[in-house]
């Protein structure tokens, strides 16, 4: 149409200038378009250089939009992580504060002379919660063994108790149950509660990490071409008012984000497992009940030891022989038997209930994040045509878009008419992130059954071990020595998204 040859390029000039490009590149009127590499080769207002600039710009705009969407999700996960982490830390700190406030009055020297052992126990629990590769059952067993030796000595200052005698006491301890049921109850409940708490918080960390890493995956050249065609070719071809057809936009973005959509199944599995593990936050083995009440088991244990003192001593002497009397030692002092401490639990304040409710709702909202991403970006960022009619931009001209919308994921892009996708070459970063999601899901499933995946039989298939990016230093794969507290490595941030200072919170 000869009349169209002289059509002005004013609208394109306006758009191109608004993008910050030099207006000297823009022709005054349409020119023949044989030079175009991406847009259809009709009469055009775009030079080769303009086409290249707009292609780069559309690519950058899509990456920005993608990063923005990811940032919103990351921020939500980071906020959740921080809220739960603060709450769990607060529970443990509260328990330790209660112990420090009530034990001196209740147990006198039985506590004050062993305050360090109690402080160390809370430190170990904190380390364990934050992802250190401690064996919780061993940690607790060693705490009770050390405590028994020290308390037995304190209860019998008139006796000489050399190391070999204390070793014998230790061997008898399991059968004698000097602390009553408290150690067993604490072991069972603490294992379940701490495993649930730490795996949930790690799950939030891994999810956030996956989103961050996937947002950095570059979009390929085929995607750049398709997005340019989708967004700017209408301007170049003199139909600047035509908005992209919705289905056309979806096909372009489904092709561009094919690898990301493959995260969907494992992402859903992870989020489902996280919602499920919150069921373990309630009851007498629940997070609030256990983490906030460690001191109550410790109180019950010392109460039991005092109650059982005479029977215990008789049985120890029967099993280990008569210890020598300490000539320098005082006589048995009845004043060491203190009054009992009535254990008070931290009543549920509703904080955890609120956190769980909000987390469940938000995790439900983002379950289909990866597969809904093309639709979300099209509707929010691409100024789509409001109707699938014959007035929208279909990539060639203003008109109806006829091809069907592709399915989700890489395999479904084999016949994508808009983006040439090599379905035999999945993106390796995304494959690695799928694996991290799988690993974290296995960890959560194990935690749901009360098992700590780090300490399951090494003969397992191993698919559940390792924490992916749930730990940001090597503590998750290192057992921390508990024999000497001076040899412990300080934990900075075994949970993602927390700063070094937060990693060393204490009461």
């Amino acid at each position: 149409d000869p009349a169209s040859k002289s059509r002005s390029c004013g609208e394109v000039r306006q758009i191109y200038g608004a993008k910050g490009f030099s207006l000297s590149d823009v022709p005054q009127a349409e020119i023949s378009g044989e030079h175009l590499r991406i847009c259809p080769q009709g009469y055009t207002c775009c030079t080769s250089e303009m086409e290249e600039n707009l292609a780069n710009r559309s690519h950058a705009e899509l990456e920005t939009a993608l990063r923005d969407s990811s940032r919103v999700l990351q921020a939500m996960l980071a906020t959740q992580l921080r809220s739960f982490d603060d709450h769990f830390q607060h529970l443990l700190n509260d328990s330790e504060r209660t112990l420090q406030a009530t034990f001196p009055g209740a147990f006198g020297e039985l506590y004050t002379q062993n305050a360090r052992a109690f402080r160390d126990l809370y430190s170990e629990l904190r380390l364990y919660y934050r992802g250190a590769n401690l064996h919780l059952e061993e940690t607790l067993a060693e705490f009770w063994a050390r405590l028994l030796e020290r308390l037995f000595k304190q209860l019998h200052p008139q006796l000489l108790l050399p190391d070999d005698y204390l070793d014998c006491l230790g061997k008898q301890a399991e059968a004698l149950r000097p602390f009553g049921e408290a150690p067993r109850e604490l072991r069972l409940r603490a294992t379940r509660a701490f495993v649930a708490a730490r795996s949930f918080v790690q799950g939030l960390g891994v999810a956030s990490d996956v989103v961050r890493k996937v947002a950095q995956v570059p979009l390929g050249p085929e995607c750049s071409r398709a997005v340019m065609k989708l967004v700017y070719c209408a301007h170049c071809l003199g139909v600047p008012g035509a908005r992209p057809c919705p289905d056309y936009c979806r096909n372009v973005l489904k092709g561009c984000l094919a690898n990301q959509a493959d995260l969907d199944a494992e992402w859903r599995n992870l989020l489902d497992s996280m919602v499920l593990i919150t069921d373990k936050f309630w009851g007498t083995s629940g997070v609030e009940s256990v983490i906030g009440s460690v001191h109550t088991w410790l109180a019950e244990a010392i109460n039991a030891l005092q109650d059982n003192r005479d029977t215990l001593t008789a049985k120890v002497i029967q099993g280990c022989g008569n210890p020598k009397v300490n000539p320098q030692g005082p006589g048995p002092e009845e004043k060491r038997r203190r009054g009992k401490l009535a254990p008070r639990e931290r009543p549920p304040s509703g904080t955890l209930e609120k956190l769980v409710s909000e987390a469940k709702a938000q995790l439900r909202d983002v379950q289909d994040f990866w597969i809904s991403l093309p639709g979300t970006l099209c509707s929010e960022k691409m100024a789509l045509s409001t109707a699938s009619d014959d007035r929208c931009w279909n990539g060639m001209a203003r008109g109806r878009y006829l091809p069907e919308v592709m399915g989700d994921g890489l395999a479904n892009q084999i016949n994508n008419p808009e983006v040439e996708v090599d379905i035999t070459k999945p993106d390796m970063t995304i494959r690695q992130q799928i694996m991290q999601l799988k690993i974290m899901t296995n960890r959560l499933r194990s935690a749901y059954n009360g098992n700590d995946v780090d300490f399951q039989d090494a003969s397992d298939d191993g698919s559940g071990s390792g924490s992916g990016d749930g730990c940001l230093d090597d503590l998750c794969s290192r057992k921390v020595s508990r024999k000497s507290s001076s040899s412990r490595t300080p934990l900075t941030h075994a949970l993602p998204g927390l700063s070094e200072q937060e990693g060393q919170k204490t009461s």
């Epitope: 049921e181 408290a182 109850e185 604490l186 409940r189 069921d279 309630w282 009851g283 007498t284 083995s285 629940g286 009940s289 009440s293 109550t296 088991w297 019950e300 009535a342 254990p343 008070r344 639990e345 009543p347 549920p348 304040s349 509703g350 904080t351 209930e353 609120k354 409710s357």
Partner: antibody, heavy 119, light 107 residues
């Protein structure tokens, strides 16, 4: 099956104390909280407090602090509630009720012990 | 403390009818609400917890809904054994509080 057995009615004098029991069977006693709930004649229900049988830890409704004391005997799978300085206001049916993993809702209840305070 | 207001205080209905009881919390309790049924001279029985989860062994004629501050219990196709008193209970933060109750009588 889960059962919470409570003793029959109690008639007590004003100013006295009463200790009632709740014997649990059919489940692991230490795995569930034991709650105590008051129901005055023809009235609604009031939560008194709960005890964690695994460690004896207690949480009370502020209104009943000093009035009720909750304890357990693990070896007998039995929870106890002692009410002291009784007045006619304390005449009511007292229920024990188990709560656990159902977000702390009370899924099994005892048949209740009726306490009448009268001189 | 969180106040729980139940309505109506009493209602009469016939076998086969559908009835709805409502419960309002004085502040947001999310989904943490339970419903109990109590028959004359008996102890309460859990029907629904967490707003809408049916307790074990409870007939599917009962259904709970709502969250935040407004909740309801719906009983479809009333049966003779459904008559009695119904209580809602917040199980959000202690002290756990109950509604005043709704007495459901046969018309």
């Amino acid at each position: 099956q889960v059962q919470l057995q409570q003793p029959g009615p109690e008639l007590v004098k004003p100013g006295a104390s009463v200790k009632m029991s709740c014997k649990a069977s059919g489940y692991t006693f230490t795995d569930y909280y034991m709650n105590w709930v008051k129901q005055s004649h023809g009235k609604s229900l009031e939560w008194i407090g709960r005890v964690n049988p695994s460690n004896g830890g207690t949480s009370y409704n502020q209104k009943f602090k000093g009035k009720a004391t909750l304890t357990v005997d693990k070896s007998l799978s039995t929870a106890y509630m002692q009410l002291n300085s009784l007045t006619s206001e304390d005449s009511a049916v007292y229920y024990c009720a188990r709560s656990g993993e159902n977000y702390y809702a009370m899924d099994y209840w005892g048949q209740g012990t009726s306490v009448t305070v009268s001189s | 403390d969180i106040q729980m207001t139940q309505s109506p205080a009493s209602l009469s209905a016939s076998v086969g009818e559908t009835v709805t009881i409502t419960c309002r919390a004085s502040e947001n309790i999310y989904s943490y609400l339970a419903w109990y049924q109590q028959k004359q001279g008996k102890s309460p029985q859990l029907l629904v917890y967490n707003g809408k989860t049916l307790a074990e062994g409870v007939s599917s004629r009962f259904s709970g809904s709502g969250s935040g501050t407004q909740f309801s219990l719906k009983i479809n196709s009333l049966q003779p054994e459904d008559f009695g008193s119904y209580y809602c209970q917040n199980h959000y933060g202690v002290p756990w509080t109950f509604g005043g109750g709704t007495k459901l009588e046969i018309k």
